[in-house]
Every structure is written in C-alpha cells, then in structure tokens.
Interface confidence: low
C-alpha cells in the first residue's frame, strides 16, 4: 500500500467522523425500459432535499420530476441506471440515503427462465459450409466491465455461430471455471450462449472468458466483473478514472474520480512535488501536496479542475479516498504540451481499482 507523507500541507483539517452513514445494501429499484419509476427519499425531517446520480447533481427535466421527497423517472432507459442518492440538509447536519436504479430486461434482475432474447443467436448452418466460430451479435458483448451490486444476478453472453456448431466453455481469471468455485454454482445457457451467476459476492470479482470453439477454430471474449459491496467497506473507485489527459500551456483540464462508498468518504487529490530539488524526504517517503480535499469549503471533491496550466503542472495526480474501514487510490498523468502543439486526449489506460487487499 502506498505510504502518504503529507509534509507539504500541514493545514489539512482532520477528517470528522461521519455523523450518519448508510451501512445496509441500498434498495435496488428495477424497471423495464419505457416504464415509469417513482422513488421516495427515505429520510426523516427531510425539509430540503437534493438528488444526485452517480455523484452528479440531478435536476428536473422532461423525464425527471422532483416533487418534495419523491423522484419520478418517466419512460426509463438503461441510461437511467446507476447509484442515486437523496440528501436532506438540516440546520445541524445532513443525511444521505442511497439506492440503485436498474433499468434492464428481466434477466439481469435474476429471472432468466423465460429468456427469449438470444434465441436468434443459435444459428444453424448449412451442413456443407464448414466455418470457424464467429460472433453473431457483438453489440451484446460491448460492455466489458460489469460493476454489479452484491446479491444481484450477472449474465455474460457470447452469441456465436459456426459449422459444426461450436461449443462454449468459461474460464475465470484464465482457469477453468468449475461449479464448485462459487457457492450456488452457476448456470450455462448454451442455447443463449450465456453464463449466469446469481447472488454475486465479492469473491466473484474477476475476469470471465468465454471460449467458443469447433474443429476449425477458436475465439474468446473476456468480461471483467466488479462486485460493488453496498455495505461498509473500503471505498471503491471506478476503473479508468481519473483518466490520463493532455493540454497545452495555458489550457484547462479536469480530472474526475468516481467514488462508491457507504461510509462517509474523504477524498484527497494529491500530487508529487519537489522540495529543495528532491522528490523524496530524508525518510525516503515522497513529498506530496494535497491540492484539494472534501470538506466544508470544498465544492465537488470528485472533480479536480486545473486552470491556465503551466509545464510545472505536468505529472501524476492521485485521487485518494478513505473511509473508516479502508482506503483506495488511483492516479492519472497530465501531459502539458508546448503551445504550438495541438492538444489531444491521451489514450486512456484502464486500471483495475486498487482494493488494497
């Protein structure tokens, strides 16, 4: 685990213990696409309520209606899925209640018995046209990273064709995935080219690879499953954020760190700095400067905005998030280009969240 020496910023306020936080797994509200959804903010004495979705302020629009303690979503779409929160602000404190919205077809909420979606993927080939395996519906395979709340059902699909009809097998973290590898086992729906795991738990996290093969060839596709524990746990940071960025001298740039934490999270943006020409102190620890941290005087701590950057601003920016149980951190690099060079966004490097196990 990285050791952080906050020698450069001694004015950092000590983190206050959270007054209240949600320990339970938030309720999951499931809606089919097109349906309307109404959720009541389950907070007492909620005089002034603000709403967020995935950490971003949620305001009313043509499909979202906010009336008192109720949130209404009309004509829900999969884009409405996410982690929602309502915050009741009072004179002495504030309290937040979290809930998940899952706009999807029935299978992802656990009912897979009447799954007709995918029957068309089981393609029968003319027996004379020998063909190596191929994907028949890559659209259903685009979402590689699946972040799923614990206790939910997960379905991975690899719709394929070929002649003779290929077989499908599944690997977890590159090794044969056996029923005894998880409590409750899993289901394979060969006709739908799918793997289904019910009631996922943290030990289900990992890479799942479908291998589809016949005598003429083999293809594979890998999904990454992250099980989001909605209970007091170390913070979880969305993979790939903050993302590497580049800008010209004088330009502006934003780093975003998306945090999932039930216990009150404390967010810090930290940068390696030099002191007397050295990056490291006499104790061998790096000099670090806290650029921004969550607290009373800080606006959205998940976003670090840098304005009118200079070459000195180039380097690694660390988003460090801690709660009373643990911490996590991820970093991104800022490249500052000379003015004559056109700015371009660097290729984003997706890193697995640092769970600091």
């Amino acid at each position: 685990r990285p050791s952080f020496s906050l020698v450069e910023d001694t004015t950092l306020e000590p983190e206050e213990p959270p007054t209240k936080y949600q320990i339970s797994q938030p309720e999951v509200y499931v809606a089919a696409p097109g349906e309307s959804l109404e959720v009541r903010c389950l907070l007492k004495d909620a005089a002034v309520i603000s709403w967020t979705k995935d950490g971003v302020h949620l305001g009313p629009n043509n499909r979202t209606v906010l009336i008192g303690e109720y949130l209404q979503i009309k004509g829900a779409t999969p884009r409405d899925s996410g982690l929602y929160a309502c915050t009741a602000s009072r004179t002495v404190d504030s309290e937040t209640w979290y809930f998940m919205v899952n706009v999807t077809d029935a299978i992802s909420s656990g009912d897979d018995e009447d799954d007709t979606d995918g029957a068309e993927d089981f393609v029968s080939e003319n027996s004379n046209n020998k063909r190596a395996p191929y994907w028949t519906n890559t659209e259903k395979m685009e979402k590689r990273l699946h972040a799923v709340p614990a206790a939910n059902t997960v379905k991975f699909r690899c719709p394929a064709g070929g002649n003779p009809m290929p077989t499908m097998r599944w690997l977890k973290n590159g090794k044969e995935f056996k029923q005894e590898h998880r409590i409750g086992g899993y289901k394979v729906r060969n006709q739908h080219w799918s793997l289904i795991m019910e009631s996922v738990v943290p030990s289900d996290k990992g890479n799942y690879t479908c291998v589809v093969e016949n005598e003429y060839g083999s293809i594979n596709h890998t999904y990454h499953l992250d099980v989001v524990e909605r209970s007091p746990h170390r913070p979880i940071l969305q993979a790939g954020l903050p993302a590497n960025a580049s800008t010209v001298v004088g330009g502006d740039v934003e780093f975003v760190c998306k945090v999932y934490s039930d216990a009150q999270p404390h967010i810090q943006w930290i940068k390696h700095v030099e002191k007397n020409g050295s990056k490291y102190g006499p104790d061998g620890l790096p000099y670090l400067k806290v650029l921004k941290h969550s607290g009373i005087n800080s606006s959205n701590a998940e976003v670090l905005a840098l304005f009118n950057v200079t070459e000195a601003d180039a380097g690694e920016y660390i988003c460090k998030v801690s709660n009373y149980i643990g911490q996590a951190n991820q970093s991104a690099w800022l490249t500052v280009l000379p003015k004559q060079q056109a700015p371009g966004r660097e290729k984003e490097i997706t890193a697995s969240p640092d769970y600091l196990e």
Epitope: I23, S231, P232, I325
Partner: antibody, heavy 117, light 110 residues
Framework: EVQLLESGGGLVQPGGSLRLSCAAS????????IHWVRQAPGKGLEWVAV????????YYADSVKGRFTISRDNSKNTLYLQMNSLRAEDTAMYYC??????????WGQGTLVTVSS | QSVLTQPPSASGTPGQRVTISCSGS????????VNWYQQLPGTAPKLLIY???QRPSGVPDRFSGSKSGTSASLAISGLRSEDEADYYC???????????FGGGTKLTVL
C-alpha cells in the same frame, strides 16, 4: 490463515486499570477496522468499541465511554484496549474481532478480565 | 436489556426446522443489514449469516437468514445435535453509531 490472539486479561481491583492486546496475523491488518466485544459470564455478547483501519475513527459503547480507549499499532499488527476505572460489571471475556463487509468475520478466542476486590 | 430482542430459548428435534426471530427498530434492523453468530459452548462466536441472508464459505446451506422491515429471522433446517449453541443477531445502530446485539437464543436439540 486469519488469526487474532487476545492477551492481557487477569484479576484487577475495582477502580484499577488493565491493558488488553490483540495480535493479528494472516491478513493485512492495516486495511481492516477491528472491534472489541465482551461477554460477561453466562450472559450475552456486548459490543465495546471499534477502531478504523488507520486509527482515525473510534466508536465506543455508552457503558465504557470515557473509561476505555481503543488504539492500534499497525506496524506491530496489534490492537489495544486500555481499560481504566474498572467496575465489577466489566468482568467478562473480551474478544477482538475483524470488521469486514458489515460483519465481524473473524474472532479471537478471548481473554478473561475479572474485576473483584 | 439488549437493544435487539430475541427469544431466550428455542428447541427442536433432529431433522426439524427451527426459526429464531430478532426484532429491532428503524435505527438499527430497519435501516441496516443483520448478521447472525453461532457460539458453541466454551468457544468464541462464529459468523453464520451476514448481510441478512449471505452465508460465509463453510456454513452449510441448512442455515438461512431473512429480514423484513425491522425484524430478522434465522432458520435452521434439518436440525442436528451439533447445532446446539447460542445464536445472536447483530446490526449497526445509526443513532448510537455502534454495533448492537440481541440477547441471544439458546437452541436445544432434543
């Protein structure tokens, strides 16, 4: 293998002090909150205190607030419970337990504290 | 007096199904997940059920948990003599900001 081993219990007079230790092994101690839970002879479990992974947050049961102090030394993989102004009703088996995913998933075998004159 | 209310005792014969209840309030069981612990005579407690209904690895599927509103319950099916123990429910209390336990239920296998 996750292991928690309590020590430091014994006989002490009312008003006296005692310091309990909990030595942890088999996991990354500095990543986990740890609880103290006690059980009086023939009685049920009573939560005493919890400390966060880095020691920055501490919570106590009302019955021990102001008398007991929970602390940890991550470099030694050790948890402590400093007990002052002990009373007869503090007599109990004291367990340390690891906090994980909203439950205490691993417990030590306990150390017995007897407060008597 | 425990914050969570459990029956002091329960009993059943081998093979039977037994249910142990746990009742709390909106600030504890009503808004937080419930855990269950088994304490065999002379031993430390052992986590049996966490987050209302999840079993840690190694716990037989004869043990199951559920929660509705401010009440939770532990069910043990196919009762065995080795299930004779004390069972405790536990959760977090958002008002006191601490862990709270039930008074415990002594299960006797007749």
């Amino acid at each position: 293998e996750v292991q928690l081993l309590e020590s430091g219990g014994g006989l002490v007079q009312p008003g006296g002090s005692l310091r309990l230790s909990c030595a942890a092994s088999g996991f990354t101690f500095s990543n986990y909150g740890i609880h103290w839970v006690r059980q009086a002879p023939g009685k049920g479990l009573e939560w005493v205190a919890v400390i966060s992974y880095d020691g920055s947050n501490k919570y106590y049961a009302d019955s021990v607030k102001g008398r007991f102090t929970i602390s940890r030394d991550n470099s030694k993989n050790t948890l402590y419970l400093q007990m002052n102004s002990l009373r007869a009703e503090d007599t109990a088996m004291y367990y340390c337990a690891r906090d994980s995913s909203s439950a205490e998933d691993y417990w030590g075998q306990g150390t017995l504290v007897t407060v008597s004159s | 007096q425990s914050v969570l209310t459990q029956p002091p005792s329960a009993s059943g014969t081998p093979g039977q199904r037994v249910t142990i209840s746990c009742s709390g309030s909106s600030s504890n069981t009503g808004s937080n997940t419930v855990n269950w612990y088994q304490q065999l005579p002379g031993t430390a407690p052992k986590l049996l059920i966490y987050r209302n209904n999840q079993r840690p690895s190694g716990v037989p599927d004869r043990f199951s948990g559920s929660k509705s509103g401010t009440s939770a319950s532990l069910a043990i099916s196919g009762l065995r003599s080795e299930d004779e123990a004390d069972y405790y429910c536990e959760t977090w209390d958002s008002n006191t900001r601490g862990v709270v336990f039930g008074g415990g239920t002594k299960l006797t296998v007749l």
